[in-house]
Interface confidence: low
Amino acid sequence: GELETSDVVTVVLGQDAKLPCFYRGDSGEQVGQVAWARVDAGEGAQELALLHSKYGLHVSPAYEGRVEQPPPPRNPLDGSVLLRNAVQADEGEYECRVSTFPAGSFQARLRLRVLVPPLPSLNPGPALEEGQGLTLAASCTAEGSPAPSVTWDTEVKGTTSSRSFKHSRSAAVTSEFHLVPSRSMNGQPLTCVVSHPGLLQDQRITHILHVSFLAEASVRGLEDQNLWHIGREGAMLKCLSEGQPPPSYNWTRLDGPLPSGVRVDGDTLGFPPLTTEHSGIYVCHVSNEFSSRDSQVTVDVLDPQEDSGKQVDLVSAS
C-alpha cells in the first residue's frame, strides 16, 4: 500500500486546515494507528495527535481543543485531521506516521502554509500644488504572508516605486505613486490595488487627487469702452479666474477709495449711473490658500458734451 497526502496545504489565517493522510492499502489491510507530529527543520518533533483504531483520538496538551477528526462518515483507512483556527505560528512541516497490519509503517510529510491577508492602508502625500516637480501623491502599504502585490490603477500619468520590508513571518510592501501636479488632475481617482492569494478579490482603496492652483485673473466688462459714458446704468466689471481651493475676490481702486454707490458682489463690481468720478484704475485681487493674482483695468467714463465729435462718429458708424 501507499500513503496519499498533499505536498502543501494552504489555508487563510483563522480557517481550519485539513491535513490529509489516507492509506491506500490492499484488501484486508488495516490501519492500527496514525500519529501526527510537527517536524520543523532544526527542532525536535512535536506530537499533535494520535488516532487509534480502537481508542479513538488523543490530542497532545499543546494542541488541546484544536485538533479534530473530520466529521463522519469516516473511512477506517483515513488518518486525516482538522487543525482548527490556523494561526501563523502553525506554518511549517507536518508528518503523519501510519501503522498498518500486516504491511507495517508508512510516513509522509506535508507543508502547511498559512496565508495572512493584508489590511492595506493608503496615506496621501503632501498637499499637491501646480508648479511642483515630481511629488509624492500617495503611498500604499500592505503587510501579509506571503508578501502582497501592491499596484496602482489610475488614468493619471505618474511613476511608482516599491519597497519591501521582511518581518519574521510576514512582509510589508509599500508602493509610492509620484506625479507632476497639474490642475487637470483635480478630482481624478488614484486607486491602490492589493492582490494576495488569501484574498478572494483584490482590495482597492481610492484617493481623490486635489491639486491647488490659481489661474491668471482677467476683467470683463470693458470690451466696448464707448458704452462707459455718463448716465449709463447697470455698468459692471467681472473678474474671471479659477482655482482650487475656489478663490475669493476683492476689488480696490488704485488711485483712491472705491466711489460711493459702487457695489462689490464677490467677483463683480456694480456701478450706479456713471459719472466722471467713476473714472479710474480698478484692481481685482484673486486669492486662495495657494496663491494670489491681480488684474487691473482703466475705466474712462466719457462725457458726450466734451467729446461730441466722437459721438457723431459713433452714430455714423452705426
Partner: antibody, heavy 117, light 107 residues
Framework: QVQLVQSGSELKKPGASVKVSCKAS????????IHWVRQAPGQGLEWIGW????????KYNERFKGRVTITADKSTNTAYMELSSLRSEDTAVYYC??????????WGQGTSVTVSS | DIQMTQSPSTLSASVGDRVTITCRAS??????VAWYQQKPGKAPKLLMY???NRFTGVPDRFSGSGYGTDFTLTISSLQAEDLAIYFC?????????FGQGTKLEIK
C-alpha cells in the same frame, strides 16, 4: 532618497532645556516612526523614545519620563526632541532615526549637546 | 529591561579573516534583533534586521543568525573599510536596548 537632517550643536547650562529638530524628506513622514537615541562620549547607544507622526502617539524610555517630550510637525515633516532639567551626564550626541516599526533603518547626522556650567 | 551583552568588546583581525561577533539577550527576544555599524564620527548604519535579513545595500559578506537569546553577526572576509564599532539592538520590548558595542580593529 530618505534623509534626516538634524539641527546644529548646542551648549547649555545645567538646569536648562534643549530642543533638537529632525527634518525628514524622501518618504511619507506620517507612515514611519521617528526614534531618538543618544550616545555619550565614548559610550554606547541609549534609546530615548519614539513618535509616530501619523497619529502623534509617543513612547518614552522610563529613564527619561518627565524630562523628555517628543513632538512632530506634519506640515514641515519635522520631529522634535526636548530634554529639560539638563545635567552634565546629558552631554551626548543625540540622533533621530526612522523606523518601521522598531528597526532603525535611516539615521540623522547627530546633534552634539554639551551641558556645562 | 532586557540587557544585550556583546562579546568581544574589542576584536583585532586581518583583511580576509572571517570575523564573528556575538550578542546575548537576558531573556528571549525571538528574532527581533538588529545590527548596526558605526564608523568614527558618523551616525550608526543598519546592517541586519530580524537577526538574519541584510538591509538594502549591505555587502553579502555580512550575515546574521540566531533566535531567542543568542545572536551572531559574521563577516565572511574582512575588508579594510569594515573598521568600525558594531552594535546589536533588541526590538522585542520597550525600552529598546543596545549592546555595549564591539570595536573591530584591522591588524
Amino acid at each position: 532618497q530618505v534623509q534626516l537632517v538634524q539641527s546644529g550643536s548646542e551648549l547649555k547650562k545645567p538646569g536648562a532645556s534643549v530642543k533638537v529638530s529632525c527634518k525628514a524628506s524622501g518618504y511619507t513622514f506620517t507612515s514611519y516612526y521617528i526614534h531618538w537615541v543618544r550616545q555619550a562620549p565614548g559610550q554606547g547607544l541609549e534609546w530615548i523614545g519614539w513618535i509616530y507622526p501619523g497619529n502623534v502617539n509617543t513612547k518614552y524610555n522610563e529613564r527619561f519620563k518627565g524630562r523628555v517630550t517628543i513632538t512632530a510637525d506634519k506640515s514641515t515633516n519635522t520631529a522634535y526632541m526636548e530634554l529639560s532639567s539638563l545635567r552634565s551626564e546629558d552631554t551626548a550626541v543625540y540622533y533621530c532615526a526612522r523606523s518601521n516599526p522598531y528597526v532603525m533603518d535611516y539615521w540623522g547626522q547627530g546633534t552634539s549637546v554639551t551641558v556645562s556650567s | 529591561d532586557i540587557q544585550m551583552t556583546q562579546s568581544p568588546s574589542t576584536l583585532s583581525a586581518s583583511v580576509g579573516d572571517r570575523v564573528t561577533i556575538t550578542c546575548r539577550a537576558s531573556q528571549s527576544v525571538n528574532n527581533d534583533v538588529a545590527w548596526y555599524q558605526q564608523k568614527p564620527g558618523k551616525a550608526p548604519k543598519l546592517l541586519m534586521y530580524y537577526a538574519s535579513n541584510r538591509f538594502t545595500g549591505v555587502p553579502d559578506r555580512f550575515s546574521g543568525s540566531g533566535y531567542g537569546t543568542d545572536f551572531t553577526l559574521t563577516i565572511s572576509s574582512l575588508q579594510a573599510e569594515d573598521l568600525a564599532i558594531y552594535f546589536c539592538q533588541q526590538a522585542y520590548r520597550s525600552p529598546y536596548t543596545f549592546g555595549q558595542g564591539t570595536k573591530l580593529e584591522i591588524k
